[in-house]
C-alpha cells in the first residue's frame, strides 16, 4: 500500500494578468464522496497555504469568497486557477488531496508545479 498518487504539471507560466491555471489529478483508491483539495506554496524554505476547498463529488468546487483560487472538478481531476499573482509569488505550488469520506481516509501530495510570474512592464507615457 502506497500513498495516493497525485499528478500535476511540472511548470506553468502565469499570464501577463497574473493568472495561472493547472490540473491536479488524483488516482482515487476508493469511491470518495467528499474530497478536500489544498494548494500549498513552498519557496525559500517556507510553506504557506494558498487556498483550500472541500467538495462533494459531482458538485462544484467552492473556495472562500476572499480566496485567490477558483476551480472546477470533473471526476478525479481538479482544474485550479490562481489569480492576482505577482513576480514575488513565483514558487512551487503543491496540490494536496485528501479523501475525507467515506472512510478510509487517504492523503496524496503532488510533486508540485513551479509557477513563474513575470510582472508586466509598465506602459510608457503617451501623448495621445
Amino acid at each position: 500500500c502506497k500513498a495516493m498518487h497525485v499528478a500535476q504539471p511540472a511548470v506553468v507560466l502565469a499570464s501577463s494578468r497574473g493568472i495561472a491555471s493547472f490540473v491536479c489529478e488524483y488516482a482515487s483508491p476508493g469511491k470518495a464522496t467528499e474530497v478536500r483539495v489544498t494548494v500549498l506554496r513552498q519557496a525559500d524554505s517556507q510553506v504557506t497555504e494558498v487556498c483550500a476547498a472541500t467538495y462533494m463529488m459531482g458538485n462544484e468546487l467552492t473556495f472562500l469568497d476572499d480566496s485567490i483560487c477558483t476551480g472546477t472538478s470533473s471526476g478525479n481531476q481538479v482544474n485550479l486557477t490562481i489569480q492576482g499573482l505577482r513576480a514575488m509569488d513565483t514558487g512551487l505550488y503543491i496540490c494536496k488531496v485528501e479523501l475525507m469520506y467515506p472512510p478510509p481516509y487517504y492523503l496524496g501530495i503532488g510533486n508540485g508545479t513551479q509557477i513563474y510570474v513575470i510582472d508586466p512592464e509598465p506602459c510608457p507615457d503617451s501623448d495621445f
Epitope: 489544498t38 524554505s45 510553506v47 485528501e98 492523503l107 501530495i109 510533486n111
Partner: nanobody, 127 residues
Framework: EVQLVESGGGLVQPGGSLRLSCAAS????????IGWFRQAPGKERETVAC??????SYADSVKGRFTISRDNAKNMVYLQMNSLRAEDTAVYYC??????????????????????WTQGTQVTVSS
C-alpha cells in the same frame, strides 16, 4: 491506507524522560515521512520532529533533548524525550506525509504536508 496509533504519554517530573511510540498499520512506513507534533492549550499545533528514510529534522526548542527514530521492520516510530521541561506540556500527535523529492530539511516537517493524524496523547511535565 496507513493508520497510525500513538502511545506513551503521561505525567513526568521536570528533567525526566518519556518515550512516545507511533505504530503504523495498513501500509509500510517506507514511502512516508513520519512527524511528531504538539499542541498546548490555547496555542497552535507545532512541529516537534520528523523522520524519513535517511533524514531527521527537529524544532529548535527540542534539539539535543528529543530523539526521533524509526523501525521499519516493526512499522514503528519513536520519540525519546529527555530533560523534559514544563513548556513541553502538550498533547502530542503523530502524523504521516508521503515523502516528496522537493522536501528540504526545513520543510519536510511542515504540518501542512501531513495527514493521517492520531487522536493525540497527553504529556504533562510537572512537579
Amino acid at each position: 491506507e496507513v493508520q497510525l496509533v500513538e502511545s506513551g504519554g503521561g505525567l513526568v517530573q521536570p528533567g525526566g524522560s518519556l518515550r512516545l511510540s507511533c505504530a503504523a498499520s495498513g501500509s509500510t512506513l517506507d514511502p512516508f515521512v513520519i512527524g511528531w507534533f504538539r499542541q498546548a492549550p490555547g496555542k497552535e499545533r507545532e512541529t516537534v520532529a520528523c523522520i524519513n528514510r535517511s533524514r531527521t529534522s527537529y524544532a529548535d526548542s527540542v534539539k539535543g533533548r528529543f530523539t526521533i527514530s524509526r523501525d521499519n521492520a516493526k512499522n514503528m516510530v519513536y520519540l525519546q524525550m529527555n530533560s523534559l521541561r514544563a513548556e513541553d506540556t502538550a498533547v502530542y500527535y503523530c502524523a504521516a506525509s508521503p515523502d516528496k523529492p522537493f522536501y528540504t530539511d526545513q520543510t519536510m516537517c511542515n504540518k501542512h504536508y501531513y495527514g493521517y493524524w492520531t487522536q493525540g496523547t497527553q504529556v504533562t511535565v510537572s512537579s
